[in-house]
Amino acid sequence: NQDLPVIKCVLINHKNNDSSVGKSSSYPMVSESPEDLGCALRPQSSGTVYEAAAVEVDVSASITLQVLVDAPGNISCLWVFKHSSLNCQPHFDLQNRGVVSMVILKMTETQAGEYLLFIQSEATNYTILFTVSIRNTLLYTLRRPYFRKMENQDALVCISESVPEPIVEWVLCDSQGESCKEESPAVVKKEEKVLHELFGTDIRCCARNELGRECTRLFTIDLNQTPQTTLPQLFLKVGEPLWIRCKAVHVNHGFGLTWELENKALEEGNYFEMSTYSTNRTMIRILFAFVSSVARNDTGYYTCSSSKHPSQSALVTIVEKGFINATNSSEDYEIDQYEEFCFSVRFKAYPQIRCTWTFSRKSFPCEQKGLDNGYSISKFCNHKHQPGEYIFHAENDDAQFTKMFTLNIRRKPQVLAEASASQASCFSDGYPLPSWTWKKCSDKSPNCTEEITEGVWNRKANRKVFGQWVSSSTLNMSEAIKGFLVKCCAYNSLGTSCETILLNSPGPFPFIQDNIS
């Protein structure tokens, strides 16, 4: 039909973006690239009805349903959702297309359903139907990938039993150390399940779906590398597959590799060998040790020996249940305002943990780095010198771990005073928490040197009053000081600040501010 307009239906996903630590929070919206919902004419329907592809949205996600209309002249429109009419404001883009949008902020169950858009143009009337549902992520899983040998081939298959079906990729690197970081140019990614090139330095398999990304590294002993100072350790849970690769390079083919478990040769069917010549005509051999489903008795020292290289071992520990080992005692730190400082947690865990750092009810990404001694470390440096409690939380399939840190920033106290009919109070946010003195100013003591000790009540670390650590001191008013100026001073190792208040009862209380370094 020549009169029908050209229309395009798109979905714009928004992500909540907030990266700054702060005293409070608001979340500016950031748009993702639009996804075409391919509006198609609905057959056998009365009138012209276009139907967009069904839209599945995560709970609390924010989206925009958008229609682009390529039709001459003005258009008018109306949204209908659950029998209610919703306001519709079309506008025109740079290509002079009519644009109609419906923004759904923080998706909830009540916002799921059919959204009907009625459009009236100079040429024709038509309806566009969007069906929006909440994605059922309760059934979603993302499992760490594991390896299997491909039947009758020298190749590894990477398997991740996840829902929805994950995208599996091999991440390969032929350099050493730091240059094998994820975004390094030395890293090659192959989006396939089967890998034939098994001679690389570093081989990982990763699986990703809507829940994120999980990776497994092929545990490797390289006989040409100097052994680590501590024995490499590999943890596995009962029933998981074991894969260890032993790799060696020699000037010619005249060498062989063998695997032993606790000085006994591995049984036939628990290893396979591959070899190739490298570019400089040296021979590379690899020997895989594998057990398709480990039991407790597979624990022990696995040693790879060569007729031309010193042998190297790894300790394989089979556990019934995953674990996270780290000291969970809380730690307090005290730093200067511009001192560089990072929190850090050292832990040993299996399976690999997922972790977050939290401050002031806001979570921050957590990076972990493996150390040579089998431990991992996570650091958090993005505290922006804000005092308070920081929480490290880690979990894996079987264990959870939480560690608390307190950060105090050394600073000279500030003082803020207030007075009521019966008392005067002073507050300070200095750290170390300050000590207090009260002095009476009179004719006899114009410099306010007469110390007041009666009726003073100090409170340490009352964090209520200003949403941060605050020390306070209260002076109960007595007849002896009514009508006088009094001075409260807070002092710590970094300095002193004072504020002077007139104890005038009843009525308002003026003040004079002093500052003494």
Partner: antibody, heavy 118, light 107 residues
Framework: QVQLVQSGAEVKKPGASVKVSCKAS????????ISWVRQAPGQGLEWMGW????????NYAQKFQGRVTMTRDTSTSTVYMELSSLRSEDTAVYYC???????????WGQGTLVTVSS | DIQMTQSPSSLSASVGDRVTITCRAS??????VNWYQQKPGKAPKLLIY???SLQSGVPSRFSGSGSGTDFTLTISSLQPEDFATYYC?????????FGQGTKLEIK
């Protein structure tokens, strides 16, 4: 979310008093001080004083001493600022602001315009 | 009272420009300086507290520096929504005092 909602605009005659309210929500009312800051038309910001909603204690800027009274009602999470003996130079927008630190103002009310005119 | 003097009092700039506003205190105030943005008919909004700490939700193009008596607010790449009046404020001692403001206009 944190909100400070102020009462509506007022027109007063010189010598009269005005009482502006500021209702707090979205946080623990007694945990943060409330300051009042005013802004005359086309001018800068001027601090008037603060109240501790926990104790009701106050501290006023010298300039407003004797003319300003700040009170609070913890049952409704509302702070009040009363300014007496009004003169034409008191024509301004009056803001209440939450004290996120001892003297930093992290959330502000929308402002109340007080016009003093004979 | 501590006087806070801002400069310039107004400035014209274009989207994408890097802009710096300075504030000088009449006495040393350590790092107790806050910066606010105010748009016509609206309440001020806290951008930066304690000289350099970015208030939550404020874009990272805003930054602050300084100590003692001299402080700066920098906007690394001006956006259309940044055209407004900016105020510095000392939170060192009572009474807290504000600068006279810097009006940032579109060139």
């Amino acid at each position: 979310q944190v909100q400070l909602v102020q009462s509506g605009a007022e027109v007063k005659k010189p010598g009269a008093s005005v009482k502006v309210s500021c209702k707090a929500s979205g946080y623990t009312f007694t945990s943060y001080g409330i300051s009042w800051v005013r802004q005359a038309p086309g001018q800068g910001l001027e601090w008037m004083g603060w109240i501790n909603p926990n104790s009701g204690g106050t501290n006023y800027a010298q300039k407003f001493q004797g003319r300003v009274t700040m009170t609070r009602d913890t049952s409704t999470s509302t702070v009040y600022m009363e300014l007496s003996s009004l003169r034409s130079e008191d024509t301004a927008v009056y803001y209440c602001a939450r004290q996120g630190g001892l003297r930093d103002f992290d959330y502000w009310g929308q402002g109340t315009l007080v016009t003093v005119s004979s | 009272d501590i006087q806070m003097t801002q400069s310039p009092s107004s400035l014209s700039a274009s989207v994408g420009d890097r802009v710096t506003i300075t504030c000088r205190a009449s006495q040393s105030i350590s790092t107790y300086v806050n910066w606010y943005q105010q748009k016509p008919g609206k309440a001020p909004k806290l951008l930066i507290y304690d000289t350099s700490s970015l208030q939550s939700g404020v874009p990272s193009r805003f930054s602050g520096s300084g100590s003692g008596t001299d402080f700066t607010l920098t906007i690394s790449s001006l956006q259309p929504e940044d055209f407004a009046t900016y105020y510095c404020q000392q939170s060192f001692i009572t009474p807290p005092t504000f600068g006279q403001g810097t009006k940032l206009e579109i060139k």
